[in-house]
């Protein structure tokens, strides 16, 4: 229904706390370089204005759209051109072009320092002094580094953060209480960020239809007892929510997400038997819980998929007269029978089915032509199953760090032109799939592995888009989203690459490496490994292992030495010589 004042409507629906949080996230995602204080001031102004509209919906400017109100605020920021360059040109445009322009200027890799966590005592002091400001800083810092973070989920993570601090700051040993808990939240939030970015990419590149297909598959897996009409309704609503968040309409997105959670909890009987625990929780926890609820038990009496989609005489009629509905039904029926498949795989199978019908329904004897379609799915299913087996076996053998290194070598060979920091980041993220998925029960591994890898590779594509350097990467990134992972997996050594010259300084280290945290040490070593591969793209695994073992030994020796600096300056050049010889 239409409201006289959109801003008053959203303020009333969301309540002041969530309203302010979402406005802060929106501003931080649009203008990623502004300080917290600058954004906090704007948020307060917007909130005060919203309150005047709540008191009187007919007050001046209360009838303006949220894009107009927020855009005007952003465009009034002093020194916009000095700080943001051509983004300032957006302010010469009218809505809706102005908002589109802001969206296009979101930076997936802003040049901001890593978000450093203060030490426990300091954190607890500032949290106790002003919890609201403390949480505001958290929202601001995460949102500006992750401009597509799913806003209502970010409020959920802030709430988690708040609860952890409340609990741990009352403990004697704050550090050992906070560290593992906050690490857990950080890990989950980072995964949430890449997953949401993938959804926005799907929406931006391929439109709502592509996202809705993703949603139908995912929801059908989770709610196999819901019928197609129910799944379609949920998928349509979920598509709207994600479209709004990806489009920067964060207030509408959070409001609609709350509505969807409410609908699901009021209609559990026709959706799933597993929702009650989620539905007993308060709003943010409820919506989060519903988004990752366990799969309902599959109905026992599902007929074979072939009956409707292969054996029936009316397949071509159904397809011709209502393509989207028929293919949607196929995707629903196949997905509800296969919670053990990844969404990407299910979408590839639906695409294969569609292509088969396109071809066969134009032939003289369609049933003879499409009669083998289900058998033709086999290689498409085997490929990711083999990928999971091979990679999980390797992970179990090497552990997370060793597995990341194996992936780093593989991907540097596939795309040696890509910058080393991007390769290292990608390999570290791809390598985490082992810890995240390989320990799961067999039937959960494939969906976990492939859908996670697809999300990480989406980030690789986004970073590569900014500065395209590898034809291999361009080829895989320009195809459809669901084909990306198989495309990357199929890449081999890039034969067109001219190896990098060996530069001794790339492999020269100093004693400061000894005091770095373990993670930073790993990154330094992985940077060296990527550079080695760029120098010798066809080096064998054995050669690389020899060099890396030597390198690890060198670091261990020198970091234990009484005179570290002397050790690094004398042993370092010897290491470089040995490396060159080992790779010759």
């Amino acid at each position: 229904e239409a409201h006289k004042s959109e801003i008053a409507h959203r303020y009333n629906d969301l309540g002041e706390q969530h309203f302010k949080g979402l406005v802060l996230i929106a501003f931080s995602q649009y203008l990623q370089k502004c300080s917290y204080d600058e954004h906090a001031k704007l948020v307060q102004e917007v909130t005060d204005f919203a309150k005047t509209c709540v008191a009187d919906e007919s007050a001046a400017n209360c009838d303006k759209s949220l894009h107009t109100l927020f855009g005007d605020k952003l465009c009034a920021i002093p020194n916009l051109r000095e700080n943001y360059g051509e983004l300032a040109d957006c302010c010469t445009k009218q809505e809706p072009e102005r908002n589109e322009c802001f969206l296009q200027h979101k930076d997936d890799n802003p040049s901001l320092p890593p978000f450093e966590r203060p030490e426990a005592e300091a954190m607890c002091t500032s949290f106790k002094e002003n919890p609201t400001t403390f949480m505001g800083h958290y929202l601001h810092e995460v949102a500006r580094r992750h401009p597509y973070f799913y806003a209502p989920e970010l409020l959920y993570y802030a709430e988690q953060y708040n609860e952890i601090l409340t609990q741990c700051c009352a403990e004697a040993d704050k550090e050992s209480c906070l560290t593992p808990k906050l690490d857990g939240v950080k890990e989950k939030a980072l995964v949430s960020s890449v997953r949401q970015r993938m959804k926005c990419s799907s929406m931006q590149k391929f439109g709502e239809r592509a996202f809705k297909a993703w949603a139908v598959a995912r929801l059908s897996q989770t709610f196999p007892n819901a019928d197609f009409a129910e799944i379609t309704k949920l998928a349509t609503d979920l598509t709207k929510v994600n479209k709004e968040c990806c489009h920067g309409d964060l207030l509408e997105c959070a409001d609609d997400r709350a509505e969807l959670a409410k609908y699901m909890c009021e209609n559990q009987a026709t959706i799933s038997s597993k929702l009650q625990t989620c539905c007993d929780k308060p709003l943010l926890k409820k919506a989060h819980c519903l988004s990752e609820v366990e799969h309902d038990t599959m109905p026992a009496d599902l007929p074979a998929i072939a009956a409707d989609f292969v054996e029936d005489q009316e397949v071509c009629k159904n397809y011709a007269e209502a393509k989207d509905v028929f293919l949607g039904t196929f995707l629903y029926e196949y997905s509800r029978r296969h919670p053990d498949y990844s969404v990407s795989l299910l979408l590839r199978l639906a695409k294969k089915y569609e292509a088969t019908l396109e071809k066969c329904c134009a032939e003289a004897n369609p049933p003879a032509c499409y009669g083998t379609v289900l058998a033709e799915f086999q290689p498409l299913v085997e490929e990711p199953k083999n990928l999971v087996k091979t990679n999980c076996d390797l992970y179990e053998k090497l552990g997370e760090y060793g597995f990341q290194n194996a992936i780093l070598v593989r991907y540097t060979q596939k795309a040696p032109q890509v910058s080393t920091p991007t390769l290292v980041e990608a390999a570290r993220n791809l390598g985490r799939v082992g810890t995240k998925c390989c320990t799961l029960p067999e039937d959960q591994r494939l969906p976990c592995v492939e859908d996670y890898l697809s999300a990480i590779l989406n980030r690789v594509c986004l970073l590569h888009e900014k500065t395209p350097v590898s034809e291999h990467v361009t080829k895989c990134c320009s195809g459809s989203l669901v084909e990306r992972r198989p495309c990357f997996s199929a890449l081999t050594v890039d034969e067109t690459y001219v190896p990098k010259e060996f530069k001794a300084e790339t492999f020269t280290f100093h004693s400061d490496i000894c005091t770095l945290p373990e993670k930073e040490k790993q990154i330094k070593k992985q940077t060296a490994l990527a550079e080695l591969v760029k120098h010798k793209p066809k080096a064998t695994a054995e050669q690389l292992k020899t060099v890396m073992d030597d390198f690890a030994q060198f670091l261990d020796t020198c970091c234990k030495a009484a005179d570290k600096d002397t050790c690094f300056s004398t042993e370092g050049p010897n290491l470089v010589t040995r490396c060159k010889d080992a790779l010759a």
């Epitope: 009409a229 007929p303 209502a322």
Partner: nanobody, 126 residues
Amino acid sequence: EVQLLESGGGLVQPGGSLRLSCAASGRYIDETAVAWFRQAPGKGREFVAGIGGGVDITYYADSVKGRFTISRDNSKNTLYLQMNSLRPEDTAVYYCGTRPGRPLITSKVADLYPYWGQGTLVTVSS
């Protein structure tokens, strides 16, 4: 739970007409694939006509094409079968069946329909 109730059957002379109705409750009729089947004494259930849910695609058995018309009235949540030019071989108990959640009729196989009415008898005889 879906309930279906057929009505409109009776005795009719060859060449005559009848209109069968199937009232549904517990589910909107436009959201689900619905079909008419018939069963003559000593025979299995045979597909007569069907209509898709959400999309008005209609399907007919070859033996009734041009004589029977399937339709529905969403406001009344009712399915109809208009039967013209009736023949003695059309004599049977007529059932309506539904496959909730199937937006299209994708089968003429009775086993794939989980919900049925109790049937209405149609006798074509002079």
